[in-house]
Amino acid sequence: QQAPYWTHPQRMEKKLHAVPAGNTVKFRCPAAGNPTPTIRWLKDGQAFHGENRIGGIRLRHQHWSLVMESVVPSDRGTYTCLVENAVGSIRYNYLLDVLERSPHRPILQAGLPANTTAVVGSDVELLCKVYSDAQPHIQWLKHIVINGSSFGADGFPYVQVLKTADINSSEVEVLYLRNVSAEDAGEYTCLAGNSIGLSYQSAWLTVLPEEDPTWTAAAPEARYTD
C-alpha cells in the first residue's frame, strides 16, 4: 500500500494562472498510489462541482483534471485538488486570476529597433521591446531589392523573414547579426502581431568598411584637430 503522490510535479509548477476572460482554463494534478486514489476539487476551500457556473465544468478523473471554459471574473479564486486514498491524502493549490483588461494590438517601445552603425566583421544586436496582453508573435524582416526595385507593383516593400518567435508579454526580442558584411546593410523591421492586430517599427543598419589600422591609430589626435 502507498499513500498518494504526484506523478508529474513538473506539470504543476505553474501555480498562478492569469488568463483573459473568455479563455479556457485547465488544472491538472496527476497522481498515483495504492489503492488508486480519488480526486476532488475545492474552490476557496469549499467543495466545487460547478453547478453555479454558466457552462459548468468538466472533471476528467482519468486525466486528474478540471476544465473551465469561457472563464469570467467570478471564476477567480483558489482551486485545490485533493487526492486521497485509504493510506493518506495530498493537496495542491492553484490560483486563478481572470484578466479583464482590454487586449490591444502590440505596443512597441519607441526608438527600438534603433538605427545602428557597425564595422564589417563586427557583431550587431537589434532590439525590439514588445508589450502585449495577448501572446504576440514576432518577426524580424529585412527589406530587400528584387530586380533593382525595393517595392512591388502593389507599392509595398519586398521583405525577407529572418526570424520568427512567439514571446511572452514584455520580453525583449533580439536579432543577432554575426560578422556583418556590406550586404547586411539596409532596413530591418520588427513586426509584432497578436489576435487584435499588427504593429511594426523599422531601423537602418549602416555597415562601414574595415577600419584602416593607420587611420585608427591616428584617430584620437584627429578628434582635436580643427
Epitope: T24, R105, Q135, L191, S195, I196, Q201
Partner: antibody, heavy 124, light 112 residues
Framework: EVQLLESGGGVVQPGRSLRLSCAAS????????MHWVRQAPGKGLEWVAV????????YYADSVKGRFTISRDNSKNTLSLQMNSLRVEDTAIYYC?????????????????WGQGTMVTVSS | DIVMTQTPLSLSVTPGQPASISCRSS???????????VYWYVQKSGQPPQLLIY???NRFSGVPDRFSGSGSRTDFTLKISRVEAEDVGVYYC?????????FGGGTKVEIK
C-alpha cells in the same frame, strides 16, 4: 478568390443553443486571427469575439462572455461560434470576418474580408 | 471601451456634390507605431459591410479615389468628393486598436 461562408443560423427559443460555422477559402486560414461581428435588425454593427491564428487566445464582448465560445479547426479551414443560453437580444445577422495575419501587411491587417452573414432569431 | 460617435445620423446629397461624415473616438487611436487605426466601411442594402478606408487615410483596393479619409488622434472625417448614385448606403467608422473593437452608430447617405 478569398471567401467566407457562414452557416448554422435559424430560429431558436430563449435559453437554447446554436452553433454557427464559417468556411474559409482562398487564403491560408491558419495564418489569420478570425472575428465574429453581429448586426441586430435595423441596428449598427457589434463586435462579438476574436480567436488568434492558432486558437490559443480568445476574447469576447461583455454581452456574450460566459455564454458564447469561439473556436477553430485549422485542418478544416473552419471557424465556429457556440452560442449557449441564447437571449432575445442575441437576434442578429452574424458575420465572420478575417482578422490580422502573419507577416508584413500589404494592405490592411485584417477586417477586410467579411462573409455574407447568417441570421439568428431568438424568439419564444 | 473606446466609444465611437458618428455624425450626422443621415445625409441627403445631390449627385455630384461633396459629402462629409465625422467620427470622434473617446480615446486617441494614434498607436505607438505611428499609425492611426480608424477604418471606414459602407454597407449597402442587404450586403455585408465593405471596407473603404483603413489606417485613417489609406484607400482599400478597388475603392474610387473620390473617397478620402483624414483626421488625427480622436477626430476623423470621411469625404466623398462627388457623390454618385451607387454611394447610397450606411457608413460606419471603426476603431481597430483594442478589443472590444467598436463601431460608430452609422450615417445613412441618400441621394436627393
Amino acid at each position: 478568390e478569398v471567401q467566407l461562408l457562414e452557416s448554422g443560423g435559424g430560429v431558436v427559443q430563449p435559453g437554447r443553443s446554436l452553433r454557427l460555422s464559417c468556411a474559409a477559402s482562398g487564403f491560408t486560414f491558419s495564418s489569420y486571427a478570425m472575428h465574429w461581428v453581429r448586426q441586430a435588425p435595423g441596428k449598427g454593427l457589434e463586435w462579438v469575439a476574436v480567436i488568434s491564428y492558432d486558437g490559443s487566445n480568445k476574447y469576447y464582448a461583455d454581452s456574450v462572455k460566459g455564454r458564447f465560445t469561439i473556436s477553430r479547426d485549422n485542418s478544416k479551414n473552419t471557424l465556429s461560434l457556440q452560442m449557449n443560453s441564447l437571449r432575445v437580444e442575441d437576434t442578429a445577422i452574424y458575420y465572420c470576418v478575417r482578422g490580422a495575419g502573419h507577416g508584413f501587411p500589404t494592405g490592411p491587417d485584417g477586417f477586410d474580408i467579411w462573409g455574407q452573414g447568417t441570421m439568428v432569431t431568438v424568439s419564444s | 471601451d473606446i466609444v465611437m460617435t458618428q455624425t450626422p445620423l443621415s445625409l441627403s446629397v445631390t449627385p455630384g456634390q461633396p459629402a462629409s461624415i465625422s467620427c470622434r473616438s473617446s480615446r486617441s487611436l494614434l498607436h505607438s507605431d505611428g499609425k492611426t487605426y480608424v477604418y471606414w466601411y459602407v454597407q449597402k442594402s442587404g450586403q455585408p459591410p465593405q471596407l473603404l478606408i483603413y489606417e485613417l487615410s489609406n484607400r482599400f483596393s478597388g475603392v474610387p479615389d473620390r473617397f478620402s479619409g483624414s483626421g488625427s488622434r480622436t477626430d476623423f472625417t470621411l469625404k466623398i468628393s462627388r457623390v454618385e448614385a451607387e454611394d447610397v448606403g450606411v457608413y460606419y467608422c471603426m476603431q481597430y486598436v483594442e478589443a472590444p473593437l467598436t463601431f460608430g452608430g452609422g450615417t445613412k447617405v441618400e441621394i436627393k
